[in-house]
């Protein structure tokens, strides 16, 4: 039975040209995390594999930095980066857990961070 929950940074906003940390945390399970995929819709941003380490998609290699931890730092933001991001935790023996983050990239100089929220 899948008992874990993923806590994410929730709905977040950031300034154009700036950077943002996408962060998820899996809790309430003893399952082993074998891999975390970061995706934007069906597009791969990066993978952190427990055995092999990080792989960054070619499309993002110049502006994505691994970490902190299993998170991802997205740099040189553009308005086109606005949208949904998913952290997909592959675990054993539970299976797959998915967390969702919505990022809004703002033109203005004021960007407020939204509240954290959980996805069971």
């Amino acid at each position: 039975m899948m008992t874990g929950t993923i806590e994410t940074t929730g709905n977040i906003s950031a300034e154009k040209g700036g950077s943002i940390i996408l962060q998820c945390h899996l809790s309430s399970t003893t399952a082993q995390v074998t891999q975390v995929n970061w995706e934007q819709q069906d597009q791969l941003l990066a993978i952190c594999n427990a055995d092999l380490g990080w792989h960054i998609s070619p499309s993002f290699k110049d502006r994505v930095a691994p970490g902190p931890g299993l998170g991802l730092t997205l740099q040189s933001l553009t308005v086109n980066d606005t949208g949904e991001y998913f952290c997909i935790y592959h675990t054993y023996p539970d299976g797959t857990y998915t967390g969702r983050i919505f990022l809004e990239v703002l033109e203005s100089s004021v960007a407020e961070h939204g509240a954290r929220f959980q996805i069971p």
Partner: antibody, heavy 120, light 107 residues
Framework: QVQLQQSGGDLMKPGASVKISCKAT????????IEWVKQRPGHGLEWIGE????????YYNEKFKGKAIFTADTSSSTAYMQLSSLTSEDSAVYYC?????????????WGQGTSLTVSS | DIQMTQTTSSLSASLGDRVTISCSAS??????LHWYQQKPDGTVKLLIY???SLHSGVPSRFSGSGSGTDYSLTISNLEPEDIATYYC?????????FGGGTKLEIK
């Protein structure tokens, strides 16, 4: 030494499905992506997509979504590509190649190719 | 998608010649470009990665250069075994895309 041995050529009827195999030897299968590439005369080389064996993570060129499905069997170090609803446009030589996990992005060894002909 | 263009589809040269094959991209690639060789029997090999790095086992007569949108592969002293079709490939953005190929023949 590194080898990617592909299955033999096929003659298939329109509307049918086919599964092409790519058996890897001489390296650690799960440390490399398996890439799939299509070659039609006059159309050059087209990247279909990739799979990371062991993780099940696969990514597709938009053009081939719904046409190709990748799987991999780590116990036999074999990757597969299934092509469905075949038409004459699918007549081509299909290659598998490997790309090291991490930020390498080049296809350093290729299979010998599998020729597929779709004809009634 | 990034379009890769190899304007010369076929090229004829003599043994010992210096041959240059060019490739251009629809947008800047920041040197994120590879070169592959396909022999007449269909065998494909990586020659050059990241614009100018020679893959292991590839003879030093092969070299690559370029920047921005324009790149080239040079064979400094053409040998009979170099008869093949040469493809450039970008990895600046997915999907990976290839040039249409340049077929090299002996005069």
């Amino acid at each position: 030494q590194v080898q990617l041995q592909q299955s033999g050529g096929d003659l298939m009827k329109p509307g049918a499905s086919v599964k092409i195999s790519c058996k890897a030897t001489g390296y650690t299968f799960s440390n490399y992506w398996i890439e799939w590439v299509k070659q039609r005369p006059g159309h050059g080389l087209e990247w279909i997509g990739e799979i990371l064996p062991g993780s099940g993570s696969s990514y597709y060129n938009e053009k081939f979504k719904g046409k190709a499905i990748f799987t991999a069997d780590t116990s036999s170090s074999t990757a597969y590509m299934q092509l469905s609803s075949l038409t004459s446009e699918d007549s081509a030589v299909y290659y598998c190649a490997r790309q090291k996990y991490g930020n390498y992005y080049y296809f350093d060894f290729w299979g010998q190719g599998t020729s597929l002909t779709v004809s009634s | 998608d990034i379009q890769m263009t190899q304007t010369t589809s076929s090229l004829s040269a003599s043994l010992g010649d210096r041959v240059t094959i060019s490739c251009s991209a629809s947008q800047g690639l920041s040197n994120y470009l590879h070169w592959y060789q396909q022999k007449p029997d269909g065998t494909v090999k990586l020659l050059i990665y990241y614009t100018s790095s020679l893959h292991s086992g590839v003879p030093s007569r092969f070299s690559g250069s370029g920047s921005g949108t324009d790149y080239s592969l040079t064979i400094s002293n053409l040998e009979p075994e170099d008869i093949a079709t040469y493809y450039c490939q970008q990895y600046s953005k997915l999907p990976y895309t290839f040039g249409g190929g340049t077929k090299l023949e002996i005069k």
